[in-house]
């Protein structure tokens, strides 16, 4: 919650210096605090702009100081405004001449809706003039000169919210300069009620705290704190958590504290009077000395804190037995914490009695967001709240506040968090040298993006296309050798920088790829794989001339595509072929070879071949006759793999002619899948057959195809293959 306090010192202006100080206590406003003249309350006041300065004694405070010679320009109404997360809080106050003809009983007066109210002004100067009363600068009432009493009153038998405003009194011949001001604040609700429709019940706001009609929360007077304002602050302190201090020799003497409506203005506890410069009489305490001590067991009454209970007693009147409450204290929290961006688990530790519960401990971010503990534990003397921020980023840097609010009081401790950007190299590492099992790398760790100093560096590496985790080595120098690599393997490399602190590992930098050198001999050259029979394939290669004296041999690996059998054959190095036998007919095999010495050589590329067929080939499929002209036509087809088809025969004859009058066209390259028949007669019907041949024989066509050539002048036609059963 926003804690905004306006200190009016002094509201009655004489020839002394006077000031307004606006303090944002325990939070960081999004926009600057503003202090201005409240023309809503008084339209016809002085127009001069205010000279607002930063209060050097406090981090988030603004101040206006009037020197004695400016006294004539001070009279009027003022405001202070603070904003956080869209919420604006405005506090109002007034200043008037000490030499005014009348003086108000109080600077502000807070009443409940429906209350019977008397707004009173004390006559200070006697004049033979009518007295006049204004509300918000507009005339409302006058008293004839001979009837002006010592106490001039405005009576409101049933105060309503519209009655609220700044009431001023003066003689008719006076002006703003001789006017006395008091502000009436009318709570929108009746006593003890709050809510938009005023039908909720307030909690008790002790020590003259005021129940806020919109939220039901207590606004505590200066010098008291907690949910019900029951807890007295330490001497001369104020604010929601009592962490602001009055720096005067006599504490908060001569400070008028103004808080958000409906509180208004009052002296700090222990003081009374319009100038807050009168101490409470014995037996009285609190703001404006309005509270009476009724200490149960004859305990002493302190004008600042009320009853000072004996050990073992507590409560406003020391009416309850129990361990005396102890204001919580936040411990072991450094003033400055450096954090690496990412996950962050801040800890807030507090003592006090009763010990704070997890609900009573919060963490407030610089933007005003309130965080609650993710984890909580306590010992005999301390409560420890652990918060979790899943992703803290540099914009989260600033003043964070650990806040503890128990029945024994409230305490806040601001601390500074500086969020660092994790380092990341800008460049990929460079490969200086490689062998078949090592690489020399320049890690290129600088320049890097992000924050230093760098605590350690890691070189990460892994083979490309392998689903294994990255391996890493810690490095201290810029040049590093990677050992125990696989030969002829492509690797990727990157560098990760680590800065100090938890979670200091930065993102890995750009990736560099490299391939290790080969090991062993290259594969045989001129490899050729051909079928020999239904159960054998023949692999041949060019003679091998080794560069060293080492013994060598050729290793041939063959595996079936259809079945899961594999065989590796060793062939003496002086041979240039090997017959792969005991194979299955009509099966496809994959074969590769390498030349091995003591070290294994590199594998060749895969070669594939089918063994010869043990059955007649199937008919060519997808037979189409197209591009028909008067003398030619294109025939296309497809054949099935694996039947050792060596040739295709196209047989055609004029329809109706004898069987022996056909023409055979033999296509010996089985990879050809179309052929153009030429020299045909125009306007003639042909019967076309197509066969496939392999080592066993020819395929059996189920039907013939009909082809009719066009007349000489016509354009080509497509024929989907008119089928004629044989």
């Amino acid at each position: 919650a926003m804690d905004l306090i306006l200190i009016n010192s002094l509201p009655l202006v004489s020839d002394a210096e006077t000031s307004l100080t606006c303090i944002a206590s325990g939070w960081r406003p999004h926009e600057p605090i503003t202090i201005g003249r409240d023309f809503e309350a008084l339209m016809n006041q002085h127009q001069d702009p205010l000279e607002v300065t930063q209060d050097v004694t406090r981090e988030w405070a603004k101040k206006v100081v009037w020197k004695r010679e400016k006294a004539s320009k001070i009279n009027g109404a003022y405001f202070c405004e603070g904003r956080v997360r869209g919420e604006a809080i405005r506090i109002r106050t007034m200043k008037m001449r000490q030499q005014a003809s009348f003086l108000p009983a109080t600077l502000t007066m807070t009443v409940d809706k429906g209350d019977n109210v008397n707004i009173s002004f004390k006559k200070v100067l006697i004049k033979e003039e009518d007295a006049v009363i204004y509300k918000n600068g507009s005339f409302i009432h006058s008293v004839p000169r001979h009837e002006v009493p010592d106490i001039l009153e405005v009576h409101l038998p049933h105060a309503q919210p519209q009655d609220a405003g700044v009431y001023s009194a003066r003689y008719i011949g006076g002006n703003l300069f001789t006017s006395a001001f008091t502000r009436l604040i009318v709570r929108r609700c009746e006593a003890q009620k709050w809510g938009p429709e005023c039908n909720h019940l307030c909690t008790a706001c002790m020590n003259n705290g005021v129940c806020h009609e919109d939220t039901g929360e207590c606004i505590c007077p200066p010098g008291f704190m907690g949910r019900t304002c029951e807890k007295a602050c330490e001497l001369h302190t104020f604010g929601r958590t009592c962490k602001e201090r009055c720096s005067g020799q006599e504490g908060c003497k001569s400070y008028v504290f103004c808080l958000p409506d409906p509180y208004g203005c009052s002296c700090a506890t222990g003081w009374k009077g319009l100038q807050c410069n009168e101490a409470c009489h014995p037996g009285f305490y609190g703001p404006d000395c309005k509270l009476r001590c009724s200490c149960n067991n004859g305990e002493m009454c302190d004008r600042f804190q009320g009853c000072l209970c004996s050990p073992g007693w507590q409560g406003l009147q020391c009416e309850r037995e129990g361990i005396p409450r102890m204001t919580p204290k936040i411990v072991d929290l450094p003033d400055h914490i450096e954090v690496n961006s990412g996950k962050f688990n801040p800890i807030c530790k507090a003592s006090g009695w009763p010990l704070p519960t997890n609900e009573e401990m919060t963490l407030v971010k610089p933007d005003g967001t309130v965080l609650h503990p993710k984890d909580f534990n306590h010992t005999d003397h301390f409560s420890v709240a652990i918060f979790t921020i899943h992703r803290i980023l540099p914009p989260d840097s600033g003043v964070w506040v650990c806040s503890v609010n128990t029945v024994a009081g409230m305490v806040e401790k601001p601390f500074n968090i500086s969020v660092k950007v994790l380092p990341k190299p800008l460049n990929a590492p460079n490969v200086i040298d490689t062998g078949h099992n090592f690489a020399v790398i320049n890690i290129s760790s600088e320049p890097y993006f992000g924050d230093g100093p760098i605590k350690s560096k890691k070189l990460l590496y892994k083979p490309v296309n392998h689903y294994e985790a990255w391996q890493h080595i810690q490095v201290t120098n810029e040049i590093v050798t990677l050992n125990y690599l696989e030969p002829r393997t492509e690797y990727e490399l990157c560098v990760q920088l680590v800065r100090r602190g938890e979670g200091g590992e930065g993102h890995p930098g750009p990736v560099r790829r490299f391939t290790t050198a080969s090991i062993g001999l290259p594969p045989p050259r001129g490899l050729n794989l051909l079928p020999k029979s239904q159960t054998t394939l023949n692999l041949t290669w060019q003679p091998i001339f080794p560069s060293s004296e080492d013994d060598f041999y050729v290793e041939v690996e063959r595996r079936s595509v259809q079945k899961s059998d594999q065989q590796n054959i060793k062939v003496p190095g002086n041979l240039t072929s090997v017959l792969l036998n005991n194979l299955h007919p009509r099966e496809q095999y994959v074969v590769r070879a390498r030349v091995n010495t003591k070290a294994q050589g590199e594998w060749s590329e895969d070669l594939t071949a089918w063994t010869l067929s043990d059955i007649l080939p199937p008919q060519p499929e997808n037979i189409k006759i197209s591009n028909i002209t008067h003398s030619s036509a294109v025939i296309s087809w497809t054949i099935l793999d694996g039947y050792s088809i060596s040739s295709i025969t196209i047989r055609y004859k004029v329809q109706g002619k004898n069987e022996d009058q056909h023409v055979d066209v033999k296509i010996k390259n089985a990879t050809i899948t179309q052929y153009q028949l030429k020299g045909l007669e125009p306007e003639t019907a042909y019967q076309v057959d197509i066969f496939a041949e392999n080592n066993i024989g020819s395929s059996n066509p189920a039907f013939s195809h009909e082809l009719v050539t066009l007349p000489e002048s016509q354009a080509p036609a497509d024929l989907g293959g008119g089928k004629m059963l044989l």
């Epitope: 003890q192 809510g195 938009p196 039908n199 019940l201 909690t203 008790a204 919109d214 009763p354």
Partner: antibody, heavy 117, light 113 residues
Framework: QVQLVQSGGGVVQPGRSLRLSCAAS????????MHWVRQAPGKGLEWVAV????????YYADSVKGRFTISRDNSKNMLQLQMNRLRSEDTAVYYC??????????WGQGTVITVSS | DIQMTQSPDSLAVSLGERATINCKSS????????????LAWYQQKPGQPPNLLMY???TRESGVPDRFSGSGSGTDFTLTISSLQAEDVAVYYC?????????FGQGTRLEIK
Amino acid sequence: QVQLVQSGGGVVQPGRSLRLSCAASGATFSNYAMHWVRQAPGKGLEWVAVISYDGENKYYADSVKGRFTISRDNSKNMLQLQMNRLRSEDTAVYYCATPKGGALEIWGQGTVITVSS
Amino acid sequence: DIQMTQSPDSLAVSLGERATINCKSSQSVLYSSNNKNYLAWYQQKPGQPPNLLMYWASTRESGVPDRFSGSGSGTDFTLTISSLQAEDVAVYYCQQYYSAPITFGQGTRLEIK
């Protein structure tokens, strides 16, 4: 933080009376308004009554007005609900609760009231 | 009295998935003077009293995990659990406190699919 411990539940015949109690410890009981809320078996939550911190103001749900009385004894840190002329529809788990603004922050453990002949 | 209506009556969501519960009031619970929505959310597990999760429609109560979030304004509100955990199985209630008597929604039963 207030802790609330309830007592006084049981089985009662229609038309009879019963008194529920809620004992508070921890924070200053006398500073807080107090509520009663009930929950019929397998049903949702229904607000019953509220009393101001000093006992001066009391409000009731229409369904219990004239039959139930909320009271408190701040010297004993005790909240009570006197239930007269009980009906079968008053069968429920009854909870006492302290508010945080208008939300109910701290709840008693609940006490079961069964109105049955 | 202000009526509160929740939807759906029951909901089954896989662990780790997002769960969304809706609440509609018969009149606006947004107070224009302070721009606050007078709405709270509760979680109730079997055999236990309700537990306050949210107030002012979107302010998380102390100790409530940040996977719970509240949104909406005026008459339409949503409670979202960003990544459902086993311990989130419960009945969830919305409640208005704009006007007395305070009133609750009928509840939404949340289960694991």
